[in-house]
Interface confidence: low
C-alpha cells in the first residue's frame, strides 16, 4: 500500500522537510502532489511525468518545492503556514490512480523566555506570588523548575493559563527559589534566566545567648540577641522594663548584684511590622549556683533507748550556705531533746528514745540552690527487749 512519511514530522521553521514515499507501484505515468487531504487541482503543488522527467509547477507551488524521481517531495525554508496535510496522487499505466496522504508540523524556534512576577517582595504567610512565563506562544509546553528541580507536589503551588502561570499561595521563607521557566515545542526548548524571591518574614522569637543565668560580681555581661528575619531585625534592649540601647549586643563591664534583673530583647521588622520579645533573668551573686551534695555522719547508728545520746554531723565544702535537718520528712528539731549547734552542722539527741528511730538527712541551701545528703538510719534498742527498727544504715 502506498504510504508517505514526513522526515522529520516536526520541522523547525526555516528548515526543510522531506515527504518520503513508500511502496510506490510499478508501471507509472507519473505523480502529483497536492496541499491538503485530497486531490484538488486548485491546490496542486507540482506534477511529474516519468517519461520526460519533467516537473510542472502547480497553483500552490511556492518555489521552495523539489520533486524527485522516486516521488518524494522536498520543501525548503518551511514556514508555519506549511503545516498540514499533503496528498500524493500516483497515476499508474492502467490509468488507475492511487493516493496517499502525509502530514508534518512546523514549529518556530523558541526564544529565550523570561519570568514576570506580580510581587517580588512578598510577606511570609500573607502574600501570594504569581510568576508568568513570557512570551505566550502557541503549541508550546511550559515547564517550571524550582531549585533546578521540577515542581514538587504541593497544595501551595498552582499552575494555570496552560501552565504558563505559576502561583505560590501563602509564600514561606523557603520559597526563595531560584525559579526558572522552560518553553518547549517538538523542535526546540529554551530556559529562562533564574529569578529569586525576596520573601519578607519575621522576626521569629528572639534567642538571647549565652544561656547562662548566674554571673559573679566583677564579671563582664555580654548578651547577644538573634531573631530570624528578612530584612534583618532591628534590636533593642530593656533592663527591668527600662530602655537601654538599640543594638543587637548588650555589654556591661564589671557587673554588680545591682545588675541582676530581667533583660528583654526586642526584635522589630519594619517591613512586616511585626515585633517579638524574649526575656532573660540575670542573677549576679557570690553564691554558688550549684551546691554540692553534703555528707552525713553519726557518732553511732545503733543506740540504747533512754540511755545513750547521738550526734549527727552534716559536712559541706560550700560557703555561704545554710543547713536544715529532716527526720521522717519532718523538719527538726522537733523536741527538747534535740539540739542544733555549730551553725546547724551538728544535730544532738540526748537522750535517745524509741520514737527517734528512723531515717535522718540534712539539706544545704543558699538562695539559689540546694542539695540533700543521702539518708542515714538510726536504730534504737532497749535492754532485755527485742530489737526494734533493726534496719541497717541507709
Amino acid at each position: 500500500q502506498l504510504t508517505t512519511e514526513s522526515m522529520p514530522f516536526n520541522v523547525a521553521e526555516g528548515k526543510e522537510v522531506l515527504l518520503l514515499v513508500h511502496n510506490l507501484p510499478q508501471q507509472l505515468f507519473g505523480y502529483s502532489w497536492y496541499k491538503g487531504e485530497r486531490v484538488d487541482g486548485n491546490r496542486q503543488i507540482v506534477g511529474y511525468a516519468i517519461g520526460t522527467q519533467q516537473a510542472t509547477p502547480g497553483p500552490a507551488n511556492s518555489g521552495r518545492e523539489t520533486i524527485y524521481p522516486n516521488a518524494s517531495l522536498l520543501i525548503q525554508n518551511v514556514t508555519q503556514n506549511d503545516t498540514g496535510f499533503y496528498t500524493l496522487q500516483v497515476i499508474k499505466s492502467d490509468l488507475v490512480n492511487e493516493e496517499a496522504t502525509g502530514q508534518f508540523h512546523v514549529y518556530p524556534e523558541l526564544p529565550k523566555p523570561s519570568i514576570s512576577s506580580n510581587n517580588s517582595n512578598p510577606v511570609e504567610d500573607k502574600d501570594a506570588v504569581a510568576f508568568t512565563c513570557e512570551p505566550e506562544t502557541q503549541d508550546t509546553t511550559y515547564l517550571w523548575w524550582i531549585n533546578n528541580q521540577s515542581l514538587p507536589v504541593s497544595p501551595r503551588l498552582q499552575l494555570s493559563n496552560g501552565n504558563r502561570t505559576l502561583t505560590l499561595l501563602s509564600v514561606t521563607r523557603n520559597d526563595t527559589g531560584p525559579y526558572e521557566c522552560e518553553i518547549q515545542n517538538p523542535v526546540s526548548a529554551n530556559r529562562s534566566d533564574p529569578v529569586t524571591l525576596n520573601v519578607t518574614y519575621g522576626p521569629d522569637t528572639p534567642t538571647i545567648s549565652p544561656s547562662d543565668t548566674y554571673y559573679r560580681p566583677g564579671a563582664n555581661l555580654s548578651l547577644s540577641c538573634y531573631a530570624a528575619s528578612n530584612p534583618p531585625a532591628q534590636y533593642s534592649w530593656l533592663i527591668n522594663g527600662t530602655f537601654q540601647q538599640s543594638t543587637q549586643e548588650l555589654f556591661i563591664p564589671n557587673i554588680t548584684v545591682n545588675n541582676s534583673g530581667s533583660y528583654t530583647c526586642h526584635a522589630n521588622n519594619s517591613v512586616t511590622g511585626c515585633n517579638r520579645t524574649t526575656v532573660k533573668t540575670i542573677i549576679v551573686t557570690e553564691l554558688s549556683p550549684v551546691v554540692a551534695k553534703p555528707q552525713i555522719k553519726a557518732s553511732k547508728t545503733t543506740v540504747t533507748g533512754d540511755k545513750d545520746s547521738v550526734n549527727l554531723t552534716c559536712s559541706t565544702n560550700d560557703t555561704g550556705i545554710s543547713i536544715r535537718w529532716f527526720f521522717k520528712n519532718q523538719s527538726l528539731p522537733s523536741s527538747e531533746r534535740m539540739k542544733l549547734s555549730q551553725g546547724n552542722t551538728t544535730l544532738s539527741i540526748n537522750p535517745v528514745k524509741r520514737e527517734d528511730a528512723g531515717t535522718y538527712w540534712c539539706e544545704v541551701f543558699n538562695p539559689i540552690s540546694k542539695n540533700q545528703s543521702d539518708p542515714i538510719m538510726l536504730n534504737v534498742n532497749y535492754n532485755a527487749l527485742p530489737q526494734e527498727n533493726g534496719l541497717s544504715p541507709g
Epitope: T3, F9, N10, T101
Partner: antibody
Amino acid sequence: EVQLLESGGGLVQPGGSLRLSCAASGFTFSDYDMSWVRQAPGKGLEWVSMIYSGSSSKYYADSVKGRFTISRDNSKNTLYLQMNSLRAEDTAVYYCAKAPLPFYFRPKSYYYAMDVWGQGTLVTVSS
Amino acid sequence: QSVLTQPPSASGTPGQRVTISCSGSSSNIGSNNVTWYQQLPGTAPKLLIYANSHRPSGVPDRFSGSKSGTSASLAISGLRSEDEADYYCGSWDSSLNAYVFGGGTKLTVL
C-alpha cells in the same frame, strides 16, 4: 478516564477470518496512532500492526503481512484488525494500544511506544 | 527468536536494586529510542519507561531507564514484592519498519 475495550475474539478454524474491534474513550481518538499487539499463551509480546492517526500510514509485522489489515473509523472512535487466512500460531490474546503522545509528537525520538492498553481479547485458531 | 535480547529471568530481595538489560542493533536501539513495559500476572502490559529514560505519570521513581549504543537497561531500586512481573523492552526497527519487543524478563522478588 482513557479506556480501550477490545471485542471480536473467539474460536475460529485455520484458514478462517475474524475481525477485532477496539472501542476507545476518554481521549481524542483521531489524534493518536494506534497499534495491535498480541501475546500467545505463556509467551512474550509480539507487535502486530500500527496505523497513523489519519490512517495515512500502516505498518505490519512480517508474520501477518498480507493476511491482516489494520483500519480505523475516527468518527466512531474505533480501531479494527481484519484477520484472514488464520493459522494456529495466530492463537493469542490481542491487545489494542494507543501511542503516548498525539500525532504531532510523532518523531521516532519520542513517539514509538504504547501507553494505554486494552484488557485483551482471546483469539483461538483451532480445528 | 526476538529481535531484542533480554535475560529470561532476574531476581532480587526486597530493597535491592535490580537491572534488566536489553540488547539490540544499530537499526533499532542504535537509532531509535527504547520503551519498557511491565506486565503483572494476568493483566495487560503497562508503559513503564518511554524514550529511553522518561517515566510516565504514576510510575515510581524507583524505576529508571538508560541507553548506550545498541543496548538499554531498566533499573529497579528499592525492590518491592509488587514489582514481581514480566518486563519487556521495545523499540522501532528502521530496517524492518516495525516495532520489535524483547523476549521478556520474569522478575522474581525473593
